[in-house]
């Protein structure tokens, strides 16, 4: 029949070339003389002249090695024609499959491979998986069938069975316990990948294995004991670096150091911090220690890490022993801001208050006051007895150096230590207001019509405070009362000028006499400037020959 | 009838070259791989290449490698034999040979010979 | 490279007698071998492929067989064109190694 099996080919064949193959042959061939033909990849397509086939006699033949990792089956069609060329049999598939011969050795997918694994892990734990490929064929023959192995591993500490491979996966995992970084760190193992599914050409690779820290070791205090002096009252002073030593990898949560002050600190005096490159802790004051109050303090420091320990292990402890230094305080006014009520005005010498301060230092030491700042000048200190005293005239009304009718100065204490240091108080004296000022109108220059005059409303203002202000009573005076009338309005903060005879165009002086609710009466000269015209002016129109 | 016949033969200096031609008739020329055999003044026979029927694909035993090439020109009929660098043991009487039935060497020419000396 | 051992190099034997030539592969070569013969006149003619089958227009007197490495060419009945040289060609390893030849010689 005209039909062919599929032929199999080994790759690799060592010839002699042209090698036939098989014999097409149609059974036409008794009655016409065939001629044969074959086309396809391989045959008259690339990789074109693998195959070719003898005309006459129908023999198929090799003309090269087959490589069946370059392509593992030919597709070739058989043709038969007669002599003048028609066709005589359907063309026929001709498969030739090239069988694998094992000629490629497993390749690792990576010179080197690496994986890491937490020291401490329990046997059974993969650590990564390592590849090899081999281009020969897996499914019909073991050529291609990769087999893992652990050639060596070094170091060999604690022994040399610390890992193990799958055989068909390359999944490495831990076989032994007892790994720890802080004595192997990092594993070199040298695999091997081996064809024939263990029994054929071997290649090998890298498996470099990185041991991961866990806490497994504790911080300990080096030394254990310290003792520190630190002067009263500073505030965040360097009081003593503490040092620790931890075998967990450095600059790692399990290395890096965490303190706490577990005793000795009941005021909350002080605070301990980590530094981040040294790993010290650095003791500090959070708050002024008083020598006066308590000379000594013992500290108890216990140290742990930033990740929490992965076994039990007994924690580090530090003894710090401060002892607090002395030194020369400055005395303290108290209260530090002192409020004083004071008549404004009141005469020269008259005590205005007594303002002294402490000295915390123990021993008795001599303080001596004066004034630091005082602004207007109006008061003096007696050295010895902080008796403030007034030197000039307090004026509540004195815009310059009272504000909201407080006055402020600074004082001075001054102790006989030495060197001697000094304390600052302040003192707050709040004028109480004298009815001192009378009213005053605002403007004063006004121009009005002499013709259907306009009533000027003029407003009152008096620097006192109430009740020395309104309402306000207004009267005029030296005859201005008889072309001009003043009323003060119903609220009594304005005083109403009214014009009540016809004055020529000119310019002149009305004489206003205020008086507040304290009948302080202030006497005011207004400047009134009366133009012919009508109604409501603000300067006279047409040429103005007035002085 | 399968015919082949040689020619090109001649006398050449040691390190000269030589072309040899075969003319084949009376066979689908292009569908046969083709080979030299060469026979020594000992008689004794020497396979010196083949060509496959396409000409894509060419064999030489170490001998001759490097120093002789065969071609092939299937619109011609004809098979060539380059001949270069060529010592006194290449004199011989050359024949082209084609496989039949898949095999060596089905039909013979009837030589061309080849003299090297100086 | 496969040796071929052909033998005997000449050999003398009447008209109506049969002979036979043998070959020996010096490697396994399978049945890919051929005896050709040599006319005085230098023309080479292949008689048997594949160890044991005739090309055609092959007298019938001409038989090829195996025993092992061993290859023989019989000639059963000698006729006067066949005292001519005779060669053996393997063709299953490369190179292609041919024997030296038999010179059959009437006697």
């Known amino acids: 029949d005209w039909v062919v099996a599929p032929i199999s080919v080994p790759e690799n064949g060592k010839g002699p070339f042209p090698q036939r193959l098989n014999q097409l042959k149609s059974n036409k061939d008794r009655d016409t003389k065939i001629f044969y033909s074959i086309t396809g990849p391989g045959a008259d397509s690339p990789p074109e002249g693998v195959f070719a086939v003898e005309k006459e006699t129908g023999w198929l033949l090799l003309n090269k090695p087959l490589d069946r990792e370059e392509i593992a089956k030919y597709e070739l069609y058989g043709h038969a024609v007669s002599e003048n060329g028609a066709s005589v049999e359907e063309p026929m598939n001709i498969s030739i499959i090239v069988t694998d011969q094992n000629d490629n050795k497993p390749k690792f997918t990576q010179d080197t491979f690496r994986g890491s694994v937490l020291e401490g892990v329990l046997p059974g734990t993969s650590v990564m998986q390592v590849t090899a490929t081999d281009e020969d064929d897996a499914i019909y023959t073991y050529n291609g069938v990769v087999a893992y192995s652990i050639h060596s591993q070094e170091p060999k500490d604690p022994h040399d069975l610390m890992f193990t491979i799958h055989r068909s996966t390359g999944t490495i995992s831990v076989i032994s316990s007892g790994l720890d970084r802080e004595k192997v760190p990092e594993y070199t193992l040298t695999i091997q990948a081996t064809d024939m599914d263990g029994d054929g050409s071997t290649t090998t690779a890298v498996a470099v294995v990185e041991i991961l820290d866990a806490n497994d070791n504790a911080p300990m205090f080096d030394p254990q004991k310290y003792e520190a002096h630190v002067p009263e009252n500073a505030v965040g002073h360097e009081v003593q670096r503490l040092t620790v030593t931890d075998l967990d990898a450095p600059n790692s949560p399990a290395w890096r150091a965490t303190y706490l002050i577990m005793g000795g600190d009941d005021g909350d005096h002080f605070t301990i911090t980590t530094h981040p490159e040294s790993n010290q802790g650095i003791l500090t004051t959070r708050k002024g220690l008083d020598f006066e109050a308590k000379n000594q303090h013992t500290l108890y420091v216990e140290v742990t890490n930033e990740a929490p320990f992965v076994l039990k292990l007994p924690t580090s402890t530090a003894t710090i022993v401060v002892h607090v230094e002395d030194v020369n305080e400055a005395p303290v006014f108290v209260p530090p801001s002192k409020v004083v009520e004071v008549q404004e005005g009141i005469p020269t010498g008259e005590p205005v208050c007594v303002y002294t301060a402490e000295d915390p230092d123990k021993e008795n030491q001599k303080i001596s006051y004066r004034i630091l700042r005082d602004p207007a000048g109006w008061l003096a200190m007696d050295p010895d007895s902080g008796q403030v005293t007034a030197v000039g005239t307090l004026d509540r009304e004195d815009e310059q150096f009272v504000r909201n009718n407080i006055y402020e100065v600074m004082v001075l204490a001054m102790d006989n230590g030495s060197p001697p240091t000094t304390g600052t108080g302040t003192l707050l004296l709040t004028l109480i207001d004298v009815n001192d000022h009378g009213p005053v109108p605002e403007p004063r220059q006004i121009t009005i019509c002499n013709q259907s005059p306009v009533r000027q409303v003029l407003n009152i203002t008096d620097k006192d405070l109430s009740p020395h202000t309104s309402p306000f009573q207004a009267q005029l005076t030296d005859d201005s009362d008889i072309y001009w009338t003043a009323e003060v309005n119903e609220e009594g903060d304005t005083v109403v000028l009214s014009l009540k005879k016809f004055l020529k165009q000119d310019t002149y002086d009305v004489h206003l006499s205020l008086s507040d609710h304290g009948n302080k009466e202030q006497l005011t000269v207004i400047r009134a400037t009366v133009c012919d015209c009508h109604g409501h002016v603000e300067t006279c129109p047409g040429p103005w020959k007035g002085g | 009838v399968q015919l082949v016949e040689e020619s090109g033969g001649g006398l050449v200096k040691p390190g000269g070259s030589l072309k040899l031609s075969c003319a084949a008739s009376g066979f689908t020329f292009s569908s046969y791989a083709m080979s030299w055999v060469r026979q020594t003044p000992d008689k004794r026979l020497e396979w010196v290449a083949t060509?496959?029927?396409?000409?894509?694909?060419?064999y030489y035993p170490d001998s001759v490698k490097g120093r002789f090439t065969i071609s092939r020109d299937n619109a011609k009929n004809t098979l060539y034999l380059q001949m270069s660098s060529l010592k006194s043991e290449d004199t011989a009487m050359y024949y082209c040979a084609s496989y039949y039935y898949g095999i060596p060497f089905g039909y013979w020419g009837q030589g061309t010979t080849v003299t090297v000396s100086s | 490279e496969l040796v071929m051992t052909q033998s005997p190099s000449s050999l003398s034997a009447s008209l109506g007698e049969g002979v036979s030539l043998t070959c020996r592969a010096s490697?396994?070569?399978?049945?890919?071998l051929i005896w050709l013969r040599q006319e005085p006149d230098g023309t080479i003619k292949r008689l048997i492929y594949?160890?044991?089958s005739l090309d055609s227009g092959v007298p019938k007197r001409f038989s090829g067989s195996r025993s092992g490495s061993d290859y023989s060419l019989t000639i059963s009945s000698l006729e006067s064109e066949d005292f001519v040289h005779y060669y053996c060609l393997q063709y299953g390893s490369s190179p292609l190694t041919f024997g030296a030849g038999t010179k059959l010689e009437i006697k």
């Open positions: 594949d160890t044991s």
């Open positions: 060509i496959s029927s396409g000409g894509h694909y060419t």
């Open positions: 490697q396994d070569i399978g049945i890919n």
